[in-house]
């Protein structure tokens, strides 16, 4: 806590500018008007304040807005955002995507901090659902964002938002998450033709049931082995040799190379030797 002291004569700041970097902490506290600071927040970022000076500026804003900062101030916090605690952020009501982008930009290139996680949580809860524009923004900054959500949180993602998802956004999703996302993707892409549909749905297939895989096997999709091996084991096991052959097309040859890994190993053990022999791979069931 900075002690309350009177501002020395002639030191009262008429505006937020570079001259303030020469102010001691107590001078900033005494001579910078909090309301002025709030209206000129956009200037703070351009001034090379020390961390200690930023602490003083934050303290002034906290005093001015004990119930939480207004969005007009939040949008221009810049590097001051890094000084905020999750508790501070929980008091905010952020509704503008531009504000969210501005703050995510400050943290760009770093792991998702507790502050950022809290900010995103507040923003999404405020919107009521994870809409396409929000998802677009969040996955652009944090490709693993979607997979950091619980299945319960993912259930609030509307099918229309699935169009914003890129394959790399699903890289770290586990089967429980894909179980939630797959039906949404199926719904979102349902009007696409066969080959285009497969390109879009491919990343979500880790949540597909056996009957959908059987249907795909009738469409000449040539699923690559990496995708096949991400499928649910319980969905793969009931597939026949003929169905797997049709599903993988030319990539079925790779079953030999991956025969020691699940779900390939488990599937091979379920098949009749005569059927496996038709694959021309020397696989032993």
């Amino acid at each position: 806590e900075v002690e309350k002291t009177a501002c020395p004569s002639g030191k009262k700041a008429p505006e937020i500018d570079e001259s303030l970097i020469f102010y001691k902490k107590w001078e900033l506290e005494a001579c910078v008007d909090a309301a002025l600071l709030a209206t000129q927040m956009d200037r703070v970022n351009a001034i090379p304040f020390t961390y200690e000076q930023l602490d003083v500026l934050k303290h002034k804003l906290d005093e001015l807005y004990p119930q939480g900062y207004p969005e007009s101030v939040i949008q221009h916090l810049g590097y001051l955002f890094l000084k905020m605690s999750p508790e501070d952020i929980r008091k905010w009501n952020v509704t503008s995507l531009e504000t969210l982008k501005a703050l995510l930009e400050v943290n760009k290139g770093h792991e998702m901090s507790p502050q950022v996680a809290t900010l995103i949580d507040r923003f999404v809860k405020g919107r009521g659902q994870l809409d396409k524009d929000t998802l677009d923004t969040l996955t652009a900054f944090y490709p693993g964002y979607l997979c950091s959500l619980s299945p319960e949180e993912l259930s609030s993602v509307p099918p229309s938002s699935i169009w914003a998802v890129r394959p790399q956004d699903l890289d770290t999703c586990d089967p429980r998450q894909l179980d939630v996302l797959y039906p949404k993707a199926r719904l979102a892409f349902q009007n696409m033709n066969g080959s285009e549909y497969f390109v879009k749905i491919q990343s979500f297939l880790g949540g597909a049931p056996t009957e959908d895989l059987k249907a795909l096997s009738q469409q000449n999709v040539s699923m690559d082995l990496a995708t096949f091996m991400k499928l649910r084991t319980d969905a793969v096991l009931p597939l026949t040799v003929a169905e797997v052959q049709k599903l993988l097309g030319p990539h079925v040859e790779g079953l030999k190379a991956e025969e020691r890994h699940r779900p390939v190993r488990d599937w091979i053990l379920r098949q009749r030797q005569d059927d496996l022999d038709t694959l021309g791979l020397g696989l032993q069931g």
Epitope: D171, D224, L225, G254, L281
Partner: antibody, heavy 117, light 113 residues
Framework: QVQLQQPGTELVKPGASVKLSCKAS????????MHWVKQRPGQGLEWIGN????????YYNERFMSKAKMTVDKSSSTAYMQLSSLTSEDSAVYYC??????????WGPGTLVTVSA | DIVMTQSPSSLAMSVGQKVTMSCKSS????????????LAWYQQKPGQSPTLLVY???TRESGVPDRFIGGGSGTDFTLTISSVQAEDLADYFC?????????FGGGTNLEIK
């Protein structure tokens, strides 16, 4: 040991067809897929397609879909590739190669196809 | 199609030197389940057919001298010859076997000074 035998050269006229052979020995023919690869003089390698010698199912690089047709004869452990409507662009060395799982573990010596009037 | 880009296109080395060549793919070749990278390296000596050196990006084919070392993951791969020998004069090709059509890089020609 694994051996893939291919004829050394084939001289064909423009517009004609040619059937290239690849006789395998030293392993169980129906346990390994066969691939065909094209190499034009002084240039890189181009994958044409692969074939399952057990079922005869074949898969093609789209670029060769109407150019090449792969078949096998299990009784003689021989893979074939027929090239049709030949032009000078088809003049190249064509290799058969036995799969090792996905990669190409053993290559034949190649057949040089020359398309010339 | 997956595009494979090799560099340099040619290089000249003296016997005993270490050489590293690069191969980049336009998309990942990593199977995240098995952690295998679907990339192979081939050597083609003048007037001969190619021979397999390395598969799964880093697994040396049996009979290949241990001076040939494959490395890398995802989209960036290397083939290193730890101590070049005169018989290593050849073209070296990388190939992805992740998705058809399986594609090759343009090759790196190794000359011996």
């Amino acid at each position: 040991q694994v051996q893939l035998q291919q004829p050394g050269t084939e001289l064909v006229k423009p517009g004609a067809s040619v059937k290239l052979s690849c006789k395998a020995s030293g392993y169980t023919f129906t346990n390994y897929w066969m691939h065909w690869v094209k190499q034009r003089p002084g240039q890189g390698l181009e994958w044409i397609g692969n074939i399952n010698p057990s079922s005869g199912d074949s898969y093609y690089n789209e670029r060769f879909m109407s150019k090449a047709k792969m078949t096998v004869d299990k009784s003689s452990s021989t893979a074939y590739m027929q090239l049709s409507s030949l032009t000078s662009e088809d003049s190249a060395v064509y290799y058969c190669a036995r799969s090792g799982g996905l990669w190409l573990a053993f290559w034949g010596p190649g057949t040089l196809v020359t398309v010339s009037a | 199609d997956i595009v494979m880009t090799q560099s340099p296109s040619s290089l000249a080395m003296s016997v005993g030197q270490k050489v590293t060549m690069s191969c980049k793919s336009s998309q990942t070749l990593l199977n995240s389940v098995s952690q295998n990278n679907y990339l192979a390296w081939y050597q083609q000596k003048p007037g001969q057919s190619p021979t397999l050196l390395v598969y799964f990006a880093s697994t040396r084919e049996s009979g290949v001298p241990d001076r040939f070392i494959g490395g890398g993951s995802g989209t960036d791969f290397t083939l290193t010859i730890s101590s070049v020998q005169a018989e290593d004069l050849a073209d070296y090709f990388c190939q992805q076997h992740y998705r058809t059509p399986y594609t090759f890089g343009g090759g790196t020609n190794l000359e011996i000074k």
